[in-house]
C-alpha cells in the first residue's frame, strides 16, 4: 500500500493527528522535501548574523555576517572579524603581517612571499604586508643591465592570498 | 612539464549534479593556486573561484557561491569542481588554471571540460 | 566587480598589419592586467602578464603596455597563426574579471 504521507509537497507536512492529512507547515518553520512527518524549525540571523535570504515554507533562512564581519563553516555557521589587508586575526585580535609574509585580503592568514627562485624566475616586484610579490622572467632572460625588481604596487582592495 | 588534464565531457539532467576533475603533474600541486573559469557557448570568460591546496582555502565568486564548491586533493594532486542544482544555463566549458609566480594571471590551462544540461 | 571593457570585440587585419586591442577596467588596477589567446579549438595561453611582461616563449611581436585603467595589447606584425580570439584579465580584485573578448581574423 502506498504511503498516504507521500503525496505531501515541499512546504507542508503529513499531521497524523488529522489523520494523516497534509496540512502547512507552521509559521517559523519549512519542509524542503515532499514526504514530511515533520516541519523544520528556521534558522535565526540574530545579532552578529544578518538575513541574507528569508525563511519560506520549503526552503530555510540563509545568514550572513553584518558588516565588518566574514563567514565561516558551512551555510555561513559562525561569524568572524574581519581584519586589514596586511594583517591576520589572531586570540588577541588582529596583528600585523611579519616581515616576508603578507595577506591581501579581509581575512585568512599571513602567507609566505613566493619564492620566485624555486621556480627558476626572478624578483619582479617586491612583496608587501599587503601584496605578494610578482615573480618575472627566470634571470637568464633579463638583459644585462636591466634592473629586475620594481618597486611593490600600491595595495588596494584584495586579490587573493597567493603562494 | 605542467600539465593540467580534466575530466571528460558529461551530460547531465537538470537539477542533477556533476563533479569535474583536474589533475596537476610537473610541479609542486601545493604551491599555485587552481582557479575555475566558465566559458558558456559563444560566451567570453567568467572567473568561478580558487583554492590554495595546500590548505584548501578557498575564494569564491559571489555569483558562483550556492553553485560550485571548489575542493582538492593533496594525494593525487587534483582538483575538483562540483555544480549542483543543474540548469540549462551551466552548459559551458570549465576550465581549471594555475596560477602564475603571484603576478594573478593564469599561466596553466586544462583543456576544458564540456558540460551540458539538457532534459 | 571590477567592469572589463574590451574593444573591438572584432577585427580583421592582413598579414603584417600592426594589430591593437584596448582593454579598460571600470577602476584602478595598477598594473594587475593580463592578456590571454583563445584559439578556435578552445586552447588558452597566457601571453603577457603584469600589464607588459611577456611570458617565456611568447613571440615578441606581442607587446602590451598601460597603467590604471587604460592599456593596450599590440601585435607588431599579424601573423597567420595570431587568429584568436584575446582576452584581458584584471587580476587586482577579487573575482577576478575577463574583458568580452576580441575576436581576430585575417582579411
Known amino acids: 500500500l502506498q504511503d498516504p504521507c507521500s503525496n505531501c509537497p515541499a512546504g507542508t507536512f503529513c499531521d497524523n493527528n488529522r489523520n494523516q492529512i497534509c496540512s502547512p507547515c507552521p509559521p517559523n518553520s519549512f519542509s524542503s522535501a515532499g514526504g514530511q512527518r515533520t516541519c523544520d524549525i528556521c534558522r535565526q540571523c540574530k545579532g552578529v548574523f544578518r538575513t541574507r535570504k528569508e525563511c519560506s515554507s520549503t526552503s530555510n533562512a540563509e545568514c550572513d555576517c553584518t558588516p565588518g564581519f566574514h563567514c565561516l563553516g558551512a551555510g555561513c555557521s559562525m561569524c568572524e572579524q574581519d581584519c586589514k589587508q596586511g594583517q591576520e586575526l589572531t586570540k588577541k585580535g588582529c596583528k600585523d603581517c611579519c616581515f616576508g609574509t603578507f595577506n591581501d585580503q579581509k581575512r585568512g592568514i599571513c602567507r609566505p612571499w613566493t619564492n620566485c627562485s624555486l621556480d627558476g624566475k626572478s624578483v619582479l616586484v617586491n612583496g608587501t604586508k599587503e601584496r605578494d610579490v610578482v615573480c618575472g622572467p627566470s634571470p637568464a632572460d633579463l638583459s644585462p643591465g636591466a634592473s629586475s625588481v620594481t618597486p611593490p604596487a600600491p595595495a588596494r582592495e584584495p586579490g587573493h592570498s597567493p603562494q | 612539464q605542467v600539465q593540467l588534464v580534466q575530466s571528460g565531457a558529461e551530460v547531465k539532467k537538470p537539477g542533477a549534479s556533476v563533479k569535474v576533475s583536474c589533475k596537476a603533474s610537473?610541479?609542486?600541486?601545493?604551491?599555485?593556486?587552481i582557479n575555475w573559469v566558465k566559458q558558456a557557448p559563444g560566451q567570453g570568460l567568467e572567473w568561478i573561484g580558487n583554492?590554495?591546496?595546500?590548505?584548501?582555502?578557498?575564494n569564491y565568486n559571489q555569483k558562483f557561491k550556492d553553485k560550485a564548491t571548489i575542493t582538492a586533493d593533496k594525494s593525487t594532486s587534483t582538483a575538483y569542481m562540483e555544480l549542483s542544482s543543474l540548469r540549462s544555463e551551466d552548459t559551458a566549458v570549465y576550465y581549471c588554471?594555475?596560477?602564475?609566480?603571484?603576478?594573478?594571471?593564469?599561466?596553466?590551462w586544462g583543456q576544458g571540460t564540456t558540460v551540458t544540461v539538457s532534459s | 566587480d571590477i567592469q572589463m571593457t574590451q574593444s573591438p570585440s572584432s577585427l580583421s587585419a592582413s598579414v603584417g598589419d600592426r594589430v591593437t586591442i584596448t582593454c579598460r577596467p571600470s577602476?584602478?588596477?595598477?598594473?594587475?592586467l593580463n592578456w590571454y589567446q583563445q584559439k578556435p579549438g578552445g586552447t588558452v595561453k597566457l601571453l603577457i602578464y603584469?600589464?607588459?611582461r611577456l611570458r617565456s616563449g611568447v613571440p615578441s611581436r606581442f607587446s602590451g603596455s598601460g597603467s590604471g585603467t587604460d592599456f593596450t595589447f599590440t601585435i607588431s606584425s599579424l601573423q597567420p597563426e595570431d587568429i584568436a580570439t584575446y582576452f584581458c584579465q584584471q587580476g587586482d580584485t577579487l573575482p577576478y574579471t575577463f574583458g568580452q573578448g576580441t575576436k581576430l581574423e585575417i582579411k
Open positions: 577602476q584602478d588596477i595598477s598594473n594587475y
Open positions: 603584469y600589464t607588459s
Open positions: 583554492i590554495y591546496p595546500s590548505d584548501s582555502y578557498t
Open positions: 610537473g610541479y609542486t600541486f601545493t604551491s599555485y593556486w
Open positions: 588554471t594555475r596560477d602564475y609566480g603571484s603576478s594573478y594571471s593564469f599561466d596553466y
